[in-house]
């Protein structure tokens, strides 16, 4: 049974529907949960071959990672499964759906299910309700950033099968009590709230009862308002490089940002023999600009082909959002073709604005 138009329970797991292209859905899951992401074809039409990517790297199917054309399932999720997931068209690499996934400790928040807590006939003749997974109910306080999806679970059993109801701050809690509604999944003993806001803060109590008794559990939800910040660049990227004349070089820059980042690759240049302008700021020229309407990973790569001695020098990855810019720089050394390639061992210099 479910509330409203919720019809996303498939098999033993409930899928997270894909956001509109260009939007990023932010999801929080509990450790041990099954993460299931769904990316239906835009407009319902054919999608063609797709590939699932995590943090820029294609996902390899395994016993734990189940990859389908429109769905990705990661079983028994752990902290290492946190990251940026996207479904792309294989040929064009166009991003069809992208998700920001964070895996935290139980009780779990996120619109996923692993199906292990479905109501079933326990074989007990008669009995009051009891918790079937008390170890998954240890975390009584859940703090999540605004806009995330939260799920509270109270997996229980009893005979006859108990009913479950929910209270907020001690009062009956129904879908009309919050913008965006709620999803009650009685089969999974769960309450789901999507895109939480500060007004969702409070105490949530599940009440599980049958004619032989009643049990309850209270969770406290704190919704953290995002403190916006400029983009964060991964340490050590871009890295210094040494290349042989005529070879190809790639600089990489990994950008993390709440607000959509805008990436520029800069090359430091000299003007009239000077490296800096009258106010002391370094002279640069823009080599590549990545737009705000795309998230393709190639924008985080600067490729230099058939390098010449003029290509040697300092390069900067500049990532900006509405808050400001962050910068990391690296050097390229170009050696004559007959000299052996020598690895640059110094880390790239860092600027932050």
């Amino acid at each position: 049974e479910s509330l409203g138009t919720e019809q996303r329970v498939v098999g033993r797991a409930a899928e997270v529907p894909g956001p509109e292209p260009g939007q990023q859905e932010q999801l929080v899951f509990g450790s041990g949960d099954a993460v299931e992401l769904s990316c239906p074809p835009p407009g319902g039409g054919p999608m063609g071959p797709t590939v699932w990517v995590k943090d820029g790297t294609g996902l390899v199917p395994s016993e734990r990672v189940l990859v389908g054309p429109q769905r990705l399932q990661v079983l028994n999720a752990s902290h290492e499964d946190s990251g940026a997931y996207s479904c792309r068209q294989r040929l064009t690499q166009r991003v069809l759906c992208h998700f920001s996934v964070r895996v935290t400790d139980a009780p779990s928040s996120g619109d996923d299910e692993d199906g292990e807590d479905e109501a079933e006939d326990t074989g007990v003749d008669t009995g009051a309700p009891y918790w079937t997974r008390p170890e998954r109910m240890d975390k009584k306080l859940l703090a999540v950033p605004a806009a995330n999806t939260v799920r509270f679970r109270c997996p229980a059993a009893g005979n006859p099968t108990p009913s479950i109801s929910w209270l907020k701050n001690g009062r009956e809690f129904r879908g009309e009590h919050r913008i965006g509604g709620i999803k009650l999944r009685h089969q999974q003993w769960s309450l789901v709230m999507e895109s939480v806001v500060p007004s969702d803060r409070g105490n949530y109590t599940c009440v599980v009862e049958n004619k032989f008794g009643s049990i309850r559990q209270t969770y406290t939800l704190d919704v953290l308002e995002r403190s916006p910040h400029r983009p964060i660049l991964q340490a050590g990227l871009p890295a210094n490089q040494t290349a042989v004349l005529g070879s190809d070089v790639e600089f990489h820059c990994k950008v993390y940002s709440d607000a959509q980042p805008h990436i520029q690759w800069l090359k430091h240049v000299e003007v009239n023999g000077s490296k800096v302008g009258p106010d002391g700021t370094p002279y640069v020229t823009v080599l590549k600009t990545a737009g705000a309407n795309t998230t393709d990973k190639e924008l985080e790569v600067l490729s230099l082909h058939n390098v010449t001695f003029e290509d040697a020098g300092e390069y900067t990855c500049l990532a900006g959002n509405s808050i400001g810019f962050s910068h990391h720089s690296a050097w390229l050394v170009v050696l004559p073709a007959e000299e052996e390639l020598v690895e640059a061992d110094e880390a790239g210099s860092v600027y932050a604005g």
Epitope: H262, G277, D279, G280, P282, V284, L318, G320, G324, F325
Partner: antibody, heavy 126, light 108 residues
Framework: QVQLVQSGAEVKKPGASVKVSCKAS????????MHWVRQAPGQGLEWMGW????????NYAQKFQGRVTMTRDTSISTAYMELSSLRSEDTAVYYC???????????????????WGQGTLVTVSS | DIALTQPASVSGSPGQSITISCTGT?????????VSWYQQHPGKAPKLMIY???NRPSGVSNRFSGSKSGNTASLTISGLQAEDEADYYC????????FGGGTKLTVL
Amino acid sequence: QVQLVQSGAEVKKPGASVKVSCKASGYTFTSYYMHWVRQAPGQGLEWMGWINPNSGGTNYAQKFQGRVTMTRDTSISTAYMELSSLRSEDTAVYYCARYYGSSLYHYVFGGFIDYWGQGTLVTVSS
Amino acid sequence: DIALTQPASVSGSPGQSITISCTGTSSDVGGYNYVSWYQQHPGKAPKLMIYDVSNRPSGVSNRFSGSKSGNTASLTISGLQAEDEADYYCQSHHFYEVFGGGTKLTVL
């Protein structure tokens, strides 16, 4: 969201000076360059110069050298453009415009203007 | 400062495609991929439509596209609509901003 709100219309006599303000909001004022562009009635866009709100450095178009001064007040996220020795041909709409380029660098090539103020009409008439 | 050269006017019927050219030199348009295009409706501030020759900011219709060949950059508007009627300016950045003279687009 990014907003650039300019001061109201001005009427000035030839030889006088005018100072137009541009208050920025929705982003970190000191992180982005601010450019000034003007447009005479029925004419095209004419670039006047830029100010780096972080360093205070400026770069003026040759045509306006000696007559234009660009300043900023970082405490109120506001840029100013002052034009002196006004003449009738200075009658125009003056725009402040945010340039997509980090104020930590001096852009030789590349970059672009991504947001514009609503414009301030300056009329020079005797 | 030498302006970039644009046609004074172009026109097209609804649904058609039109192209506006912007000619510079090898030291601006031709030498670098740094051409932006702005749309300006009467009495309004300009709006960024294309940057770095062919990149579209988010929120701009994909009917607008940019390209470059030699020293000439082009803005193409496909599926022309009445609201596309406006002035269009190209711009190149090198040390200072250089704008084109502007092109008045009339939708017949």
